[in-house]
């Protein structure tokens, strides 16, 4: 029986050009984590396999860094990075657990300020 739960950072926001850490944590189970997949929509970003280590998808190699831990760091953020991200925990003997994170990439605070408080 699957007793574990995935805790995530939930809904997060970050500034364009900055970086963000995507983090999930599996709790309430003694199951062994053997692989974690990170995805955006249906694009595979990275896989961390207990035996094989990290694999970063070639299309994200310049902007994705493994870690910390089983998490993933996204760098040089653009507004196109806004959307849902998924961590898929492969465990033994429980099976698969999934967590969801929604990332919103915002224009820089300076740009936001200028837009909201225009001088008449």
């Amino acid at each position: 029986m699957m007793t574990g739960t995935i805790e995530t950072t939930g809904n997060i926001s970050a500034e364009k050009g900055g970086s963000i850490i995507l983090q999930c944590h599996l709790s309430s189970t003694t199951a062994q984590v053997t692989q974690v997949n990170w995805e955006q929509q249906d694009q595979l970003l990275a896989i961390c396999n207990a035996d094989l280590g990290w694999h970063i998808s070639p299309s994200f190699k310049d902007r994705v860094a493994p870690g910390p831990g089983l998490g993933l760091t996204l760098q040089s953020l653009t507004v196109n990075d806004t959307g849902e991200y998924f961590c898929i925990y492969h465990t033994y003997p429980d099976g698969t657990y999934t967590g969801r994170i929604f990332l919103e990439v915002l224009e820089s605070s300076v740009a936001e300020h200028g837009a909201r408080f225009q001088i008449p």
């Epitope: 995805e39 694009q43 896989i47 849902e84 698969t96």
Partner: antibody, heavy 118, light 107 residues
Framework: QVQLQESGPGLVKPSQTLSLTCTVS?????????WNWIRQPPGKGLEWMGY???????RYNPSLKSRVTISRDTSKNQFSLKLSSVTAADTAVYYC???????????WGQGTLVTVSS | DIQMTQSPSSLSASVGDRVTITCKAS??????VAWYQQKPGKAPKLLIY???YRDTGVPSRFSGSGSGTDFTFTISSLQPEDFATYYC?????????FGQGTRLEIK
């Protein structure tokens, strides 16, 4: 338990539009996952056609993109496939399937055969 | 698109035999491969995902291994109900693609 059931005409004339519907029971298609169409010509392999996600995002196989449209009717918990300008090469068993996040398909409908013939 | 090449395309075996099917990806897909079983007139059934993980309820005689471009699917001891067609699928990037299938027949 999630169940998927395809329905639609079994015979379509060349150059017409093929229309199929998948009715999902036991799970709301707006709750999670991506809802796919996959086809299999008689005696051949499987071809992924596209999906509509729980949030309404669609993604199509580029080999079919100009001809395929996937939509949904959330009130009926259904999603649909339209394939335009069909030819005999589109004769196939059409399956609807639920995709798990990792890109694999743990649940399928039983499939429906569509023949393209005049 | 990533091409998945299965071999052999068909094979004959007897109950109790150990059977191995291979699948080669046209590019590195790390561990993003699934395996399905399909019986005549039925939909495919997921057996293995992420190269080596059995889906819920799948008997332990079915196993998968491999990473990168080379993958193997094994049935350790064939049962009468295992005679079917088997497909590999890459789940690395869209469009998701399948192998051409391996038909497993009774010898």
């Amino acid at each position: 338990q999630v169940q998927l059931q395809e329905s639609g005409p079994g015979l379509v004339k060349p150059s017409q539009t093929l229309s199929l519907t998948c009715t999902v029971s036991g799970y709301s298609i707006t709750d999670d996952y991506a809802w796919n169409w996959i086809r299999q010509p008689p005696g051949k392999g499987l071809e992924w056609m596209g999906y509509i996600s729980y949030s309404g995002i669609t993604r199509y196989n580029p080999s079919l993109k100009s001809r395929v449209t996937i939509s949904r009717d959330t009130s009926k918990n259904q999603f649909s496939l339209k394939l335009s300008s069909v030819t005999a090469a589109d004769t196939a068993v059409y399956y609807c399937a639920r995709k798990y996040y990792g890109g694999w398909f743990p649940q399928w409908g039983q499939g429906t055969l569509v023949t393209v013939s005049s | 698109d990533i091409q998945m090449t299965q071999s052999p395309s068909s094979l004959s075996a007897s109950v109790g035999d150990r059977v191995t099917i291979t699948c080669k990806a046209s590019q590195d897909v790390f561990t993003a491969v699934a395996w399905y079983q399909q019986k005549p007139g039925k939909a495919p059934k997921l057996l293995i995902y992420s190269a080596s993980y059995r889906d819920t309820g799948v008997p332990s005689r079915f196993s998968g291994s491999g990473s990168g471009t080379d993958f193997t699917f094994t049935i350790s001891s064939l049962q009468p109900e295992d005679f079917a067609t088997y497909y590999c699928q890459q789940s690395y990037s869209t469009p998701w693609t399948f192998g051409q299938g391996t038909r497993l027949e009774i010898k």
